[in-house]
């Protein structure tokens, strides 16, 4: 028979979990793990199960996004009696199993973190020997990726009536505050667009009317750092063009 269950227990246990006759399926994961972009994170996951001393074939799986249906980011399989879980899938080669599934530990290391990794992850184990059973974390662990600001685009664009406007887009977590400085501007917070749908870490600030030639600097700052980039506006007076 095959059973798919959802867990009710999802608290981080720091101790290794071993089966006893009365144990049921459960998974222990922390609600959230935080790490900086570019660094590594560990997604802890331990489990208990009712199949005492199970040493048959098993598969360990991690998904992203949603339980049961989300895309797999990691999968490994251990043969009967083997302590080695052979990796079959590691998305972009950045997911590595730290735990030993034979010791009820599916903990995963994620390397070279990017802001796009900021999502929820779900661990799952499948037994496929004499016993056929499987279990998956329902609530999962949220990986919160933080990042110092990075300006991803800065540009000057034409606007109606031979005027020009400047756009600055930056990413970071927490989302950075943007400020423009330049000729006759002082420090201006400008018009900041809220993060775009599906681009939660991107913030854009617009300077709607550039009235003077010269250097315009966009500064992005959050609690982890700051970044700045500049554009230059030189208009050919008497003509409708500009050099930036």
């Amino acid at each position: 028979f095959v059973r798919t269950k959802i867990d009710t227990t999802e608290n981080l246990l720091n101790t290794e979990v071993h089966s006893s006759p009365a144990q049921r399926w459960s998974m222990q994961v922390p609600p959230e793990v935080s790490a900086e972009a570019g660094d590594a994170a560990v997604l802890p996951c331990t489990f208990t199960h009712p199949h005492r001393h199970y040493d048959g074939p098993l598969t360990a799986i991690w998904r992203a996004g949603e339980p049961y249906a989300g895309p797999q980011v990691f999968r490994c399989a251990a043969a009967r009696g083997s302590e080695l879980c052979q990796t079959a899938l590691s998305l972009h080669g950045r997911f590595r199993l730290l735990g030993n599934p034979r010791r009820n530990d599916l903990s995963l290391r994620v390397e070279r973190l990017a802001l796009a990794d900021d999502r929820r992850y779900f661990c799952r184990v499948e037994f496929a020997g004499d016993v056929h059973d499987r279990y998956e974390s329902r609530h999962g662990v949220r990986l919160h990726v933080t990042a110092a600001p990075r300006i991803v685009n800065i540009s000057v664009l034409p606007s109606p009536a031979h005027a020009f406007r400047a756009l600055c887009t930056a990413e970071g977590e927490p989302p950075p505050a943007l400020a423009w400085s330049g000729p006759a501007l002082g420090n201006s917070l400008a018009a900041v667009r809220s993060p775009r749908e599906g681009h939660g870490h991107l913030v854009t600030a617009e300077l709607p009317a550039l009235t003077h030639d010269g250097r315009y600097t966009c500064t992005a700052a959050n609690s982890l750092g700051r970044s700045e980039a500049s554009v230059y506006l030189f208009r050919f007076h008497g003509a409708s063009g500009a050099s930036t």
Epitope: V33, A35, V42, P44, R96, L97, R109
Partner: antibody
């Protein structure tokens, strides 16, 4: 029984190059990452390079102090790993060990007996 | 790079407890996992893995060896010390690349 055997060491002149080889047996080579670690005479250990396996796209990593002068490679069909070192300097004189590591951990669970490389006029 | 520091030598008596320390220049622990590993090296031999991830005994290593610690401070304990344990002991970190070793602690008989 896991066996790791390094060859290719010897005396090399400064500025020269050499290729170290590491033959393995007793385990499924494809399932592991392979590394080179060196130890200068009467000194500590220094990690040199790592090559991951096929699932991990044969990614390579190098110690900054050697970047650009070393290349690690592997041949899964031969269960072997290689280290090419160029522009050799006196400070590259060391015992070079070939080591195995699990895909989940950058620690070295098996080591070869090492091969001596001496860089001298 | 993460710098690991060990004291160069430790004198012990046979049958006693030996405690070898390793200090990291920054934390090597993430979410309860400590990326510190211990090796033993005898003269003329290759190193041998003793402990991985701070406290896990490697295959075939006697139970008199144990490891502990978290964050930046780690300890390898040998209890009781036997004559066969006279060697140099190295810690290594894999928290961040490049993976680095400490200079080693030479265990000597008092």
């Amino acid at each position: 029984e896991v066996q790791i055997l390094e060859t290719g060491g010897g005396l090399v002149k400064p500025g020269g190059s050499l290729r170290l080889s590491c033959a393995t047996s007793g385990f499924n080579f494809n399932d592991y990452f392979m590394n080179w670690v060196r130890q200068a005479p009467e000194k500590g250990l220094e990690w040199v390079a790592q090559i991951r396996n096929k699932i991990y796209t044969y990614a390579t990593f190098y110690a900054e102090s050697l970047e650009g002068r070393v290349t690690i490679s592997r041949d899964d069909s031969e269960s072997s790993v290689y280290l090419q070192v160029s522009s050799l300097r006196a400070e590259d004189t060391a015992i070079y060990y070939c080591t195995r590591s699990l895909t989940g951990g950058d620690y070295f669970d098996y080591w070869g007996q090492g091969v001596m490389v001496t860089v001298s006029l | 790079d993460i710098v690991l520091t060990q004291s160069p030598a430790l004198a012990v008596s046979l049958g006693q407890r030996a405690t070898i320390s390793c200090r990291a220049s920054q934390s090597v622990t993430i979410s309860g996992y400590s990326f510190i590993h211990w090796y033993q090296q005898k003269p003329g031999q290759q190193p041998r893995l003793l402990i991985y991830r701070a406290s896990n005994l490697a295959s075939g290593i006697p139970a008199r060896f144990s490891g502990s610690g978290s964050g930046t401070d780690f300890t390898l304990t040998i209890n009781p010390v036997q004559a066969d344990d006279i060697a140099t002991y190295f810690c290594q970190q894999s928290r961040k690349s490049p993976w680095t070793f400490a200079g080693g602690t030479k265990l000597e008989l008092r």
